[in-house]
């Protein structure tokens, strides 16, 4: 029954990182003319028959993985890519520092370190303007984020979050921003 219908897109506006009590809208977008959508929250057995889910105030219980599909005739589309909706501000903010310092020469190395007083085992580093976290292959969840051979593209404002692998969609508040300055470019 699941045929060649292309998968829809699912996005969170303004962002999939949502501070507690702040609004967010999940929007499922399929081809023109489609009006039968199903938006599911995974690992909760629940779904709604609308393309748009407006959350006026983010709650912990709404954090998690979402997916959507649409129906055309009797055929279901392929499912959208999963969207991970994260509630932030659940825990106190970590601190973010740069070693050896926030000013680094082009071509040099710098390590951004995220530290927290709590026993969290997961950390995510975001650069302002980038939608996805800064990931080191297989190791993005570590507290240290080494940046090797810095270029001008690495300059900007960074923030980090801490969370637990037991509750991967409940994150801390963001750290205070750290401005990374690349000199000699």
């Amino acid at each position: 029954q699941s045929g060649p219908l292309p998968k829809p897109s699912l996005q969170a506006l303004p962002s999939s990182l949502v501070p507690l009590e702040k609004p967010v809208t999940l929007r499922c977008q399929g081809p023109p003319g489609v009006d039968l959508y199903r938006l599911e929250k995974l690992s909760s057995s629940r779904y709604q028959d609308q393309a748009v889910l407006f959350i006026p105030a983010m709650k912990r219980s709404l954090a998690g993985r979402y997916r959507c599909s649409y129906q055309n005739g009797s055929l279901w589309s392929l499912p959208s890519d999963q969207l991970e909706l994260v509630a932030t501000g659940v825990f106190a903010k970590p601190s973010l520092s740069a070693q050896p310092g926030p000013a680094v020469s082009s071509g040099g190395d710098v390590t951004l370190q995220c530290q927290t007083r709590y026993g969290f085992d997961q950390f995510a580093l975001y650069k302002e303007g980038d939608p996805a976290p800064y990931k080191n292959p297989e190791r993005w969840y570590r507290a240290s984020f080494p940046i090797i051979t810095v270029t001008a593209a690495h300059s900007g404002t960074y923030r980090c979050y801490s969370f637990s692998s037991r509750d991967p969609y409940l994150w801390s508040a963001p750290s205070d921003p750290l401005e990374l300055v690349v000199t000699g470019t």
């Epitope: 057995s45 779904y47 028959d49």
Partner: antibody, heavy 123, light 112 residues
Framework: QVQLVESGGGLVKPGGSLRLSCAAS????????MSWIRQAPGKGLEWVSS????????DYAASVKGRFTISRDNAKNSLYLQMNSLRAEDTAVYYC????????????????WGQGTLVTVSS | QSVLTQPPSVSGAPGQRVTISCTGS?????????VHWYQQLPGTAPKLLIY???NRPSGVPDRFSGSKSGTSASLAITGLQAEDEADYYC???????????FGGGTKLTVLG
Amino acid sequence: QVQLVESGGGLVKPGGSLRLSCAASGFSFSDHYMSWIRQAPGKGLEWVSSVGSEGKFIDYAASVKGRFTISRDNAKNSLYLQMNSLRAEDTAVYYCARHYREFRWHYYYFDYWGQGTLVTVSS
Amino acid sequence: QSVLTQPPSVSGAPGQRVTISCTGSSSNIGAGYDVHWYQQLPGTAPKLLIYGNSNRPSGVPDRFSGSKSGTSASLAITGLQAEDEADYYCQSHDLGAHVWVFGGGTKLTVLG
């Protein structure tokens, strides 16, 4: 309290037709997805078809697609299953079941079932 | 053949603990869908026993518990009683065509 009462079962010849009804009471029928689930004698449960709360989303098991038609009348608090081109393997007790709902969310499980109506397809 | 696989039968003496397994695939249980369990006493309609992998509706004794891991789930019954003798079915949802799927059912016999 929630009540689901099926009717319309009986003996029918292969190739024949039958229309099952499910009368719902004790809850806001138009808010809930509804399904038909069947159980052949001595066998397990088999989901047959479901319909969305507004009658828009409709799904069928592959075994009945093209032969059975699910519908609902929210004004009458009733669910229906029109069964055409019946086969011996359609012989079963047919249950009407309600899907759980909470606030804006529907759920993928059945919280209330009727007592069932027996459909026998035999020459 | 059922989409979800259950053992046809299990048995135990009164007071014992029994478990019933339910194995699915990456398109149903493994796709993020929960598992639900129903109890069908002889001659009656099925009744919801466990929803959302491990939650009990009001009125269901805490002797019944459920869990899920990966592409499978299990139902545990402790302190087995004669009135637990029934058929038990697991149920989930399948992403392929958005259909509801059941296990083949497990007949629980209370010995003695």
